[in-house]
């Protein structure tokens, strides 16, 4: 019995179906086929879980979080024992193993390994201003998404003709911050943060209004 090499790793957007491949060759009839799919979740690497089991001509559930979402892609028994996972969740990310036994055919490699990464587009980011908006002050524009895998990068732009930030601004695309030093009336305006990763983008807007000093009444 020999389980074929798998592609190594699969990426899928959350909510989309994933197919985890596993095929094998055997010299025996598929009368005593036994297939166990296991996962070592990324979030809990010391606690492997059963995903689905085929034994004695019947399919059995594994961990309840896979219940109703997992099945074999084809009619069993077969030499293609790939599975599908519907409505993928972040917690499905991990290393999946198919363990195949088909007595009396023993020996050879009976395990296939495939990594699954569930990707999540950035959630709507939260934009806020830190610091005084008085003229001459320093302000920080903050932008962060609660969700996003891979971790989003953040790009700030000023929504004017140039889309450029003021010359006194410094941007950190990893942290999602823009520091604008010595703000002036020219710093006022609408700013947009674009959070993006491999599978999506999301934006938020922020209105910066620089406060000019009130003229003093001389009486």
């Amino acid at each position: 019995l020999e389980v074929s090499e798998s592609p190594g790793s699969i990426q899928v957007a959350r909510g989309q179906p994933a197919v985890l491949p596993c095929t094998f060759t055997t010299s025996a009839a598929l009368i005593n086929l036994n297939v166990i799919w296991m996962v070592t979740p990324l979030s809990n690497a010391n606690q492997p879980e059963q995903v689905i089991l085929y034994q004695g001509g019947q399919m059995f559930d594994g961990a309840p979080r896979f219940h109703g979402r997992v099945g074999f892609t084809g009619t069993m028994p077969a030499t293609n024992v790939s599975i599908f996972i519907n409505n993928t969740q972040l917690s499905d990310t991990g290393t999946y193993q198919c363990l195949v036994n088909n007595l009396p055919d023993i020996g050879g490699r009976n395990i296939g390994v495939t990594g699954l990464t569930v990707l999540v587009p950035p959630s709507a980011p939260h934009c806020q201003i830190q610091g005084s908006q008085d003229i001459g002050s320093d302000v920080i524009l903050l932008c962060s998404s609660e969700e996003g895998i891979p971790r989003p990068t953040y790009l700030w732009e000023k929504l004017d003709n140039t889309l450029k930030l003021p010359p006194t601004a410094t941007q950190d695309q990893v942290q999602g911050t823009v520091t604008i030093r010595n703000i002036s009336a020219l710093s006022s305006g609408l700013y947009q943060c674009v959070a993006s990763n491999a599978i999506g983008t999301s934006t938020c807007l922020l209105d910066l209004q620089v406060i000019s000093p009130q003229p003093r009444n001389i009486g």
């Epitope: 219940h67 109703g68 969740q89």
Partner: antibody, heavy 117, light 107 residues
Framework: EVQVQQSGPELVKTGASVKISCKAS????????MHWVKQSHGMSLEWIGY????????TYNQKFKGKATFTVDTSSSTAYMQFNSLTSEDSAVYYC??????????WGQGTLVTVSA | DIVLTQSPATLSVTPGDSVSLSCRAS??????LHWYQQKSHESPRLLIK???QSISGIPSRFSGSGSGTDFTLSINSVETEDFGMYFC?????????FGAGTKLELK
């Protein structure tokens, strides 16, 4: 449209058994699981177990092992739950629920079982 | 078994109020937490799946959040049709379990 229709209310004597039916329509019956859930009067929900509508394999909550038995009839797209050796504690509304986006995606309307002395 | 503790047991509100219902798990359940609404003499209805994911046909005023052990169902501007019981349910480990419920009632 997915529909799950349960049998009507039952009044049964202590020590007897009752068999509740759950007829499904609007989808491929054998492609899903059917769960059973108990709701005692004014109480929360308790999961009894489920049956695979394709092969009849059942999984029970330890609490209800020996008390409940699940069966399916694929020709009529109907799932059944038999409850044995009934006591007053078994008086409740029993729901069947088809799996889907979650284990309990589509619910039947419930069957009231009243156990009397 | 995983125990789900819902609070408060009863919540009295006026239509138009925004409310948050809490569900706490006795151990981490990732995002394998679902919310159901049950009106008087009706079957439960799925509102939110996997802690925060919306269900087709459910009004957008219902939203969910949380992961691990602490979860929240939020109703933005309660309407009269929202009164009833709300249950959380976990699908992280067997046996599947429900919370005792929160009753949302008219003040």
């Amino acid at each position: 449209e997915v529909q799950v229709q349960q049998s009507g209310p039952e009044l049964v004597k202590t020590g007897a058994s009752v068999k509740i039916s759950c007829k499904a329509s609007g989808y491929s019956f054998t492609g899903y699981y059917m769960h059973w859930v108990k709701q005692s009067h004014g109480m929360s929900l308790e999961w009894i177990g489920y049956i695979s509508c394709s092969n009849g394999a059942s999984t029970y909550n330890q609490k209800f092992k020996g008390k409940a038995t699940f069966t399916v009839d694929t020709s009529s797209s109907t799932a059944y739950m038999q409850f044995n050796s009934l006591t007053s504690e078994d008086s409740a509304v029993y729901y069947c629920a088809r799996s889907g986006e979650t284990p309990f995606a589509y619910w039947g309307q419930g069957t009231l079982v009243t156990v009397s002395a | 078994d995983i125990v789900l503790t819902q609070s408060p047991a009863t919540l009295s509100v006026t239509p138009g109020d925004s409310v948050s219902l809490s569900c706490r798990a006795s151990q981490s359940i990732s995002n394998n937490l679902h919310w159901y609404q049950q009106k008087s003499h009706e079957s439960p209805r799925l509102l939110i799946k996997y802690a925060s994911q919306s269900i087709s046909g459910i009004p957008s005023r219902f939203s969910g959040s949380g992961s691990g052990t602490d979860f929240t169902l939020s109703i933005n501007s309660v309407e009269t049709e929202d009164f009833g019981m709300y249950f959380c349910q976990q699908s992280n480990s067997w046996p599947l379990t429900f919370g005792a419920g929160t009753k949302l009632e008219l003040k």
